[in-house]
């Protein structure tokens, strides 16, 4: 603000964020992932930080465990509000398997197609939720090579609550986690102790989202 | 269009190694959209997965065979290869290579290899 | 080790009949996963179908495929001379892949 109070330049605030993006979050509903509540808070707090519309930011979203559901298409909804009831509504699918390869090339495939409400010309992200190594996780290098083909951007979180509350070494599920991040890592990564946690990362994680289009 | 050619020794002796190489053409091996692999048929039955490559190097083995099989990839010859060490008369089989994206959808015509002394 | 188990291992059928295959797995394969394979006497398998139901490239529609779970099945709505051949299921989902023993589809 100058001497004379006039406005010399302004910062939008992250969360006013009215960039053009197709995100489509793919979340794994397997049986393993507990709490639910903790996923739709984290996809609450995620979304309310968006501006959501036709000429803005689009989302949609995919659940996927043995089988892969599309919960909502990238133009089903055209306000923030509306995106936020739908998310809320969502319901665990579950399924004995994690098939993670399988959800994100379903979205690759199918979530971001003009028929569903992807833009041309328009940045397509990926958010990839998981808390577990995939059973197919064998097919994992050509989903993400398909991935970086189509120029989709994508960040993973890694869920760590089953293993630590099993004591297990999240070694191995880490390193898988981080394989299906863009690069670089480091920015596209995320793991969180348990489900719980995922409300803290939010906050970085629509900075980097929002950051794609600066 | 894309074609494979399997090709390699056709008698191999009881402790050896098999060597076989699959050469692709019409296309490239290095297009990361496929895993390349060897299958194989014993006589008069069905068929079994050994394993396969991504471009990069990465593998993916059958547990049943996987202490006996190496697969690899030369992007540069547009080949990939199977060695499989330590054959019985069990190992006695046609061996395919096939191209795999959704499903295997190019195969070699395949080649017979009989371990015999 | 998904498990697949085809039946009946031989269909005795005349052209022009239709031919339902079975294809069940052990454990629930996910329908994005399995495809199908022809194969005649002397020859590499031939890819018929994809996610359980999409006909590959130059395959006929005569050719069909449904299923979901554990059960899946292929049906040739009227068979042509060439269909008599080995059919095999395929799931590739979980490691190792696997395939079925086959179906046999002969000439009666």
């Known amino acids: 603000v100058s001497p004379t109070f006039q406005v010399v330049n302004s910062i939008a605030p992250v969360q006013e964020c009215s960039t053009q993006l197709d995100i489509v979050i793919v979340l794994d509903g397997s049986n393993s992932i507990y709490p639910w509540d903790s996923v739709t808070a984290f996809l609450n707090d995620l979304l309310e930080r968006m501006d959501i519309g036709p000429k803005q930011t689009q989302v949609g979203i995919v659940q996927y465990g043995e089988n892969v559901t599309h919960e909502f298409n990238l133009n089903k909804y055209s306000s923030t509000e509306e995106v936020l009831v739908a998310a809320n509504k969502i319901v665990q699918r579950g399924g004995r398997q994690t098939m993670t390869a399988l959800g994100i090339d379903t979205a690759r495939k199918e979530a971001f197609t003009e028929a569903r409400g992807a833009r041309r010309g328009v940045k397509k992200v990926m958010v990839i939720v998981t808390d577990g190594e995939s059973h197919d996780n064998h097919r994992l290098k050509k989903v993400i090579q398909d991935c970086e083909d189509e120029n989709i951007q994508r960040f993973s979180i890694a869920i760590l609550g089953s293993y630590n509350r099993g004591n297990l070494s999240t070694e191995k599920f880490v390193e898988e986690i981080k394989s299906i991040a863009s690069e670089p890592t480091e920015k596209h990564f995320f793991n969180v102790s348990d489900e719980l946690a995922l409300v803290t990362i939010v906050k970085t994680l629509g900075e980097r989202i929002f950051a794609l289009e600066a | 269009q894309v074609q494979l050619q399997e090709s390699g020794p056709g008698l191999v002796k009881p402790s050896q190694t098999l060597s076989l190489t699959c050469t692709v053409s019409g296309g490239s091996i290095s297009r990361g959209n496929y895993y390349w692999s060897w299958i194989r048929q014993h006589p008069g039955k069905g068929l079994e997965w050994i394993g396969y490559i991504f471009y990069s190097g990465s593998t993916y083995y059958n547990p049943s065979l996987k202490s006996r099989v190496t697969i690899s990839v030369d992007t540069s010859k547009n080949q990939f290869s199977l060695k499989l060490s330590s054959v019985t008369a069990a190992d006695t089989a046609v061996y395919y290579c096939?191209?795999?994206?959704?499903?295997?959808?190019?195969w070699g015509q395949g080649t017979t290899v009989t371990v015999s002394s | 080790e998904i498990v697949l188990t085809q039946s009946p291992g031989t269909l005795s059928l005349s052209p022009g009949e239709r031919a339902t295959l079975s294809c069940r797995a052990s454990?629930?394969?996910?329908?994005?996963?399995l495809v199908w394979y022809q194969q005649k006497p002397g020859q590499a398998p031939r890819l018929l179908l994809y996610?359980?139901?999409s006909r590959a490239t130059g395959i006929p529609d005569r050719f069909s495929g449904s299923g979901s779970g554990t059960d899946f099945t292929l049906t040739i709505s009227r068979l042509e001379p060439e269909d008599f051949a080995v059919y095999y299921c395929q799931q590739y989902g979980n490691s190792p892949l696997t395939f079925g023993g086959g179906t046999k589809v002969e000439i009666k």
């Open positions: 996610d359980a139901s």
């Open positions: 096939a191209r795999d994206g959704y499903g295997m959808d190019v």
């Open positions: 454990q629930s394969v996910s329908s994005s996963y």
